[in-house]
């Protein structure tokens, strides 16, 4: 299995501690990513006064960006394992748009940015090496991406920077939940 | 100041039903990651239940599923612990929390604590 | 729900001893766990999280280590303080506790 980002030599064969299974392999992986956010966060949040905006919603109507709800059996109530597991890939296969969207927004944090793109690529293939149900994701249509990226790039200033934001905070919402559903699993 | 402060609690027969508030000052509960914990006399803490401030997803112990309702109202900075079909074992002093960060890894703000005994 | 089992649960040492608690967990919680100190009438007080991290604030006596399903607290040479009642508590799945290990005075 190869070794993904955030892990090292010492969680594969530290002293005095079991190895890492796949489940923690995988949350580590998120968190890894996470800890990305964070830090693409702050660069937006230095850089413009968009954390506090109370414009969001505005920004918001023209972006479809994956959420998790209820009918995707990925909270307790209602867990379905299967069903939440190809949300999950669905939604991080639906965000690697807006990922690619973020590779020129940054100027401190450009490899930051970077390695959450890919990262997010390694951990699609992991999650989808887990998934029985692979006939029920469905990958969004390569001209429709590039289409949403261009009219993403096109926008003013503004609206860029409100993007860029919302992007982070709803990726790092979706990580979020889907962290607590697969350690579910 | 950041606090929480805890509230409904009482004296309330086998069966019968509850509400517990819990109201933040200091910090928004939407977006922070909120959590009931319950001690009994004399005994240790037991975790009850927690949300998750994204989508509002809930998530509880084993012992309450099906019974207690964990819920929000951002606009009153408020979480609700709603109890129902209570039983003496029930009988602790529940208090809200707040986990600490965005990777909920320790209780960082702890409320006074609300009594609720279940006798008949 | 993850089964927290904490030992001992009563612990009686004396002041400048070096104690051990130990916690284990049900199934695996990675690094996602937590310990708190507790006296009476009052809220638990984090000493520790993510298995290992000291709280800033907390005396540099106070230790965690372990990651997967055995964790342990150690507390390097007892103070007065440090008569309490010591919780851990897992962050993975819901937050449940240990039983508690009550450290007494010999």
């Known amino acids: 299995a190869p070794v993904l980002p955030g892990e090292d030599s010492k969680d594969v064969a530290a002293p005095h501690s079991q190895p890492l299974t796949s489940s923690e392999r995988i949350d580590k992986h998120i968190r890894y990513i996470l800890d990305g956010i964070s830090a693409l966060r702050k660069e937006t949040c230095n850089r413009s006064n968009m954390c506090e905006s109370s414009k969001e919603a505005l920004a918001e109507n023209n972006l479809n960006l994956p959420k998790m709800a209820e009918k995707d059996g990925c909270f307790q109530s209602g867990f379905n394992e299967d069903t939440c597991l190809v949300k999950i890939i669905t939604g991080l296969l639906e965000f690697e748009v807006y990922l690619e969207y973020l590779q020129n927004r940054f100027e401190s944090s450009e490899e930051q940015a970077r390695a959450v793109q890919m990262s997010t690529k390694v951990l699609i293939q992991f999650l989808q090496k887990k998934a029985k149900n692979l006939d029920a994701i469905t990958t969004p249509e390569p001209t429709t991406n590039a289409s949403l990226l261009t009219k993403l790039q096109a926008q003013n200033q503004w609206l860029q920077d409100m993007t860029t934001h919302l992007i982070l905070r709803s990726f790092k919402e979706f990580l979020q939940s889907s962290l607590r559903a697969l350690r579910q699993m | 100041e950041v606090q929480l402060v805890e509230s409904g609690g009482g004296l309330v027969q086998p069966g019968g039903s509850l509400r517990l508030s819990c109201a933040a000052s200091g910090f928004t509960i939407s977006s922070n990651y909120m959590i009931w914990v319950r001690q009994a006399p004399g005994k240790g803490l037991e975790w009850v239940s927690d949300l998750y401030y994204y989508a509002g997803d809930t998530y509880y112990a084993d012992s309450v599923k099906g019974r207690f309702t964990m819920s929000r109202d951002i606009s009153k900075n408020t979480v609700y612990l709603q109890m129902n079909s209570l039983r003496a074992e029930d009988t602790a002093v529940y208090y809200c929390?707040?986990?600490?960060?965005?990777?909920?890894?320790?209780?960082?703000?702890w409320g006074r604590g609300t009594l609720v005994t279940v006798s008949s | 729900d993850i089964q927290m089992t904490q030992s001992p649960s009563t612990l009686s040492a004396s002041v400048g001893d070096r104690v051990t608690i130990t916690c284990r967990a049900s199934?695996?919680?990675?690094?996602?766990l937590a310990w708190y100190q507790q006296k009476p009438g009052k809220a638990p007080k984090v000493l520790i999280y993510?298995?290992?991290t000291l709280e800033s604030g907390v005396p540099s006596r106070f230790s965690g280590s372990g990651s997967g399903t055995e964790f342990t607290l150690t507390i390097s040479s007892l103070q007065p303080d440090d008569f309490a009642t010591y919780y851990c508590q897992q962050s993975w799945l819901g937050g449940s506790f240990g039983q508690g290990t009550k450290l007494e005075i010999k």
């Open positions: 929390a707040r986990w600490a960060d965005d990777h909920p890894a320790w209780v960082d703000l």
């Open positions: 199934q695996g919680i990675s690094s996602w």
């Open positions: 993510k298995a290992s």
